[in-house]
């Protein structure tokens, strides 16, 4: 492992659409890659009326979009569909949103997704 | 060197059959799900089939539901794609590619492409 | 099923030129995408994947940009090699869907 990188092994997988994929709906999934190739946690989840629906969740390719974040933050200011990417062992577990050119509270707090 | 060669495709007569074949080389074939594109002549690319690495999920796009049926024989290293009731509309130059196991799941590598024409 | 919308569907530049590509989602895709380059008579090569992330190999001319539902292919300077066609195909929802393709032509 290299200094100061959090190194991610395994992220917790969430699938809405496991029927029609033919997937587990939740679960923990390990992370698979070259081994010079980071690997990262993802979420995508929707905000309905204020209410919280997770999408997916699981492992995301090496992104340099998603280095270095220990934490799963969205920053796109209101997005259709919310995505984060970090890097750490099931750090997706828990997601946030804070819009890069507001400073207003997030939305949702860390949110985790509701059992089957 | 990660590989993938198609083989199998030819000429045949509208309602016939025809098997693909898709041998895999430079990766543990077993770990990956595969996929099955298409592209008719001077047209784009067209999703046609998938697997999961096991073999035990298989997906198919509406246009070949119920006419092809995709397989695989991981002893073998060689993803097939059996192909019945054929129509002229079929026509196309088939590729097999690797599916990446971690979203957002891009399909690399592709094979070379075997073509098969649907015609009386 | 999610319907992928390239433009232009084909563009004529010559070599040393900037070229912009752009896809188009019906719905979001977050960061789903994946862009492919085809030459003439060969099998679709991935460029770029997870909307701008550069497959290992490919020139840094190629860069790739976008989320929800607007993406970009861009490549900053045309070489000879790079006359191919394009697409971009979403990995967000099954069936997986690809765009119509760009083709890049010499001007």
């Known amino acids: 492992a290299i200094l100061g990188r959090s190194e991610t092994q395994e992220c917790l997988f969430f699938n809405a659409n496991w029927e029609k994929d033919r997937t587990n709906q939740t679960g923990v999934e390990p992370c698979y890659g070259d081994k010079d190739k980071r690997r990262h946690c993802f979420a995508t989840w929707k905000n309905i009326s204020g209410s919280i629906e997770i999408v997916k969740q699981g492992c995301w390719l090496d992104d340099i979009n998603c280095y270095d974040r220990t934490d799963c933050v969205e920053k796109k200011d209101s997005p259709e569909v919310y995505f984060c990417c970090c890097e750490g062992n099931m750090c997706n577990e828990k997601f946030s949103y804070f819009p890069e050119m507001e400073v207003t509270q997030p939305t949702s707090n860390p949110v985790t997704p509701k059992p089957p | 060197e990660v590989q993938l060669l198609e083989s199998g495709g030819g000429l045949v007569q509208p309602g016939g059959s025809l098997r693909l074949s898709c041998a895999a080389s430079g990766f543990t074939f077993s770990h990956y799900a595969m996929t099955w594109v298409r592209q008719a002549p001077g047209k784009g690319l067209e999703w046609v089939s998938g697997?999961?690495?096991?073999?035990?999920?298989?997906y198919y796009a509406d246009s070949v539901k119920g006419r092809f049926t995709i397989s695989r024989d991981n002893s073998k290293n060689t993803l097939y794609l059996q192909m019945n009731s054929l129509r002229a509309e079929d026509t196309a130059v088939y590729y097999c590619?690797?599916?990446?196991?971690?979203?957002?799941?891009?399909?690399?590598?592709w094979g070379q492409g075997t073509l098969v024409t649907v015609s009386s | 099923d999610i319907q992928m919308t390239q433009s232009p569907s084909s563009l004529s530049a010559s070599v040393g030129d900037r070229v912009t590509i752009t896809c188009r989602a019906s719905q979001s895709i977050t960061r789903f995408l994946n862009w492919y380059q085809q030459k003439p008579g060969k099998a679709p090569k991935l460029l770029i994947y997870?909307?701008?992330n550069l497959q290992v190999g490919v020139p840094s001319r190629f860069s790739g940009s976008g989320s929800g539902t607007d993406f970009t292919l861009t490549i900053s300077s045309l070489q000879p090699e790079d006359f191919a066609t394009y697409y971009c195909?979403?990995?967000?929802?099954?069936?997986?869907?690809f765009g119509g393709g760009t083709k890049v032509e010499i001007k």
């Open positions: 997870a909307a701008s």
């Open positions: 195909q979403q990995s967000y929802s099954t069936p997986p869907t």
């Open positions: 697997i999961s690495g096991s073999g035990l999920n298989t």
């Open positions: 590619a690797r599916r990446g196991h971690t979203m957002p799941q891009p399909l690399d590598p």
